[in-house]
C-alpha cells in the first residue's frame, strides 16, 4: 500500500485546513492508528492528534478544539484531519504516520501554506501643480503573505517604482506613481491594483487626480466696437479663464472706481445704459489658491454727437 496526501495544502488565514492522509492498501488491509505531528517544530516533532481505529480521536492539549476528524461517513483508511481557523503560526511541515495491519507503518509529509490577504492603502502625494517637474502622485502599500503584487491602472502617463520590506511571516510592498502634472490630468483616475493568491479578485483603490492650475485670463464683449455707443442697453464684459480649484473673479477700474450702476456678477461686468462716463480701463482679476491672472481692456464709449471713432485696446498681463 501507499499513503496519498498533498505536497502543499494552501489555506487563507482564518479558514479551515484539511490535512489529507489516505492509505491506499490492498484488500483486507486495515489502519490501526494515524498520528499527526508538526514536523518542523524547533525542539522535535510536536504532536497534533492521534486517530485510533478503536478509541477514536485524541487531540494534544496545544491543539485542543482546533483539530477534528472528517464528518461521517468516514472511510476507515482515511486518516485526514481538519485544522480549524488557520493562523500564520500554523504554516509549516506536517507529518502523518499510519500504522497498518499487516503491512506495517507508512509516513508522509505535507506543507501547510497560510495565505494572509493584504489590506491595501493608498496615500496621495503632495498637492499637484502645473509647472512642477516629476512629482509623486500617490503611493500604495499592501502587506501580506506571500508578498502581494502592486501595480497601477491609469490612462495618465507616469513612472512607477516599487520597494519591498520583508517581515518574519509576511512582506510589505509599496509602489509609487510619479508624473509631471498637467491640467489635462485633472479628474483622471489613478487606480492601485493589488493581486494576491489569497484574494478571490484583485483589490482596487482609485484616487482622482487634482492638478492645480490657472489659465490665462481674457475679456470678451468688445468684439464689435460699434455696439459700444451712448444709450446702448445690456452691454457687458465677460472674463474668461479656467482653473483648479475653480477661480474667483474680481473687477476693478484702473483709472478710478467702478461707475455707479455698473453691476459685478462673478465673471461678468454689466453696464447700465452707456454714457461716456463708462469709458475707461477695466481690469479683470482672476485668482485661485494656486495663482492669479489679470486681463485689462479699454472701453471707449462712442458718442454719436462727436464724429470720432471708437478706439479699443486689449492688454493682457500676468
Amino acid at each position: 500500500g501507499e499513503l496519498e496526501t498533498s505536497d502543499v495544502v494552501t489555506v487563507v488565514l482564518g479558514q479551515d485546513a484539511k490535512l489529507p492522509c489516505f492509505y491506499r492498501g490492498d484488500s483486507g488491509e486495515q489502519v490501526g492508528q494515524v498520528a499527526w505531528a508538526r514536523a518542523d517544530a524547533g525542539e522535535g516533532a510536536q504532536e497534533l492528534a492521534l486517530l485510533h481505529s478503536k478509541y477514536g480521536l485524541h487531540v494534544s492539549p496545544a491543539y485542543e478544539g482546533r483539530v477534528e476528524q472528517p464528518p461521517p461517513p468516514r472511510n476507515p483508511l482515511d486518516g485526514s484531519v481538519l485544522l480549524r481557523n488557520a493562523v500564520q503560526a500554523d504554516e509549516g511541515e506536517y507529518e502523518c504516520r499510519v500504522s497498518t495491519f499487516p503491512a506495517g507503518s507508512f509516513q508522509a509529509r505535507l506543507r501547510l501554506r497560510v495565505l494572509v490577504p493584504p489590506l491595501p492603502s493608498l496615500n496621495p502625494g503632495p498637492a499637484l501643480e502645473e509647472g512642477q517637474g516629476l512629482t509623486l502622485a500617490a503611493s500604495c502599500t499592501a502587506e501580506g503573505s506571500p508578498a502581494p503584487s502592486v501595480t497601477w491602472d491609469t490612462e495618465v502617463k507616469g513612472t512607477t517604482s516599487s520597494r519591498s520590506f520583508k517581515h518574519s511571516r509576511s512582506a510589505a510592498v509599496t509602489s509609487e506613481f510619479h508624473l509631471v502634472p498637467s491640467r489635462s490630468m485633472n479628474g483622471q483616475p489613478l487606480t492601485c491594483v493589488v493581486s494576491h493568491p489569497g484574494l478571490l479578485q484583485d483589490q482596487r483603490i482609485t484616487h482622482i487626480l487634482h492638478v492645480s492650475f490657472l489659465a490665462e485670463a481674457s475679456v470678451r464683449g468688445l468684439e464689435d466696437q460699434n455696439l459700444w455707443h451712448v444709450g446702448r442697453e445690456g452691454a457687458m464684459l465677460k472674463c474668461l479663464s479656467e482653473g483648479q480649484p475653480p477661480p474667483s473673479y474680481n473687477w476693478t477700474r484702473l483709472d478710478g472706481p467702478l461707475p455707479s450702476g455698473v453691476r459685478v456678477d462673478g465673471d461678468t461686468l454689466g453696464f447700465p445704459p452707456l454714457t461716456t462716463e463708462h469709458s475707461g480701463i477695466y481690469v479683470c482679476h482672476v485668482s485661485n489658491e494656486f495663482s492669479s491672472r489679470d486681463s485689462q481692456v479699454t472701453v471707449d464709449v462712442l458718442d454719436p454727437q462727436e464724429d470720432s471713432g471708437k478706439q479699443v485696446d486689449l492688454v493682457s498681463a500676468s
Epitope: 498533498s6 495544502v9 489529507p20 489516505f22 461521517p72 472511510n75 483508511l77
Partner: antibody
Amino acid sequence: QVQLQQPGAELVMPGASVKMSCKASGYTFTDYWMHWVKQRPGQGLEWIGAIDTSDSYTSYNQKFKGKATLTVDESSSTAYMQLSSLTSEDSAVYYCARWGSTMITWGYGMDNWGQGTSVTVSS
Amino acid sequence: DIQMTQTTSSLSASLGDRVTISCRASQDINNYLNWYQQKPDGTVKLLIYYTSRLHSGVPSRFSGSGSGTDYSLTISNLEQEDIATYFCQQGNTLPWTFGGGTKLEIK
C-alpha cells in the same frame, strides 16, 4: 459543469429487484463520494447510504442494509444502487448526490443532486 | 438516530418579507447542519453547509445560523423563485437524518 444523470422512472414487480444508475460528468468521479437519498410521495428525505468512489468503501443506514447495495463503475463514472425484494414501501423517488469530501475539501453538504429516479412497485 | 424537527411544515409569506425557518436536533450536532431547497419539480439544491456557510452560486439573501441543537435558515428578502420546500440535514452522526421539510408559499 457538474451533472448527475438518472433515468426518469422504473416500473417493477413486487419481490423483484431494480438497479438504478447515476452517471456523473463535469468532475473527477473518484474524487467524491456518492450518496443516495429516498423520498416517498409527499414525504421528507431519507439517507440510504454512501460509497467512496475511489475504493468502493460503503456506509449504509442500518435501516437499508440488505435492501440497498451500492456499487460504482469507475470506467464509466457511474454509481449504481440496487434495491432488492421490492414492496410498495419502496415506491419512491431515489436521488443520487455528490458529497465534497476530497483530498482538499471537507465533506459537508451534498453539493450536487441528480433529478431523481421514480420507482413504482406494482403488479 | 438523531431526530431533526422542523416544527413549521408550511409557511406563507409575501414577496420582500424576511422569512426564518427553524430546525431542532435531538442532540448536539456540532454545527454539522446543512440546508437544502427542493423546488416543486423535485430539483434539490444545497444552500447552506456547516450551519452558516453559503454554497457557491447561492444568493446572499440566504443565511444560516445556530449551534448545539437549534438552527435556522433566513431568507432576507423573499423572491418568487424562493417558493420551494426547505430541508435541514445533520451530518454529525450516522445515519444522516433530515428534517420533515418546511413548504414556503406566497400569500
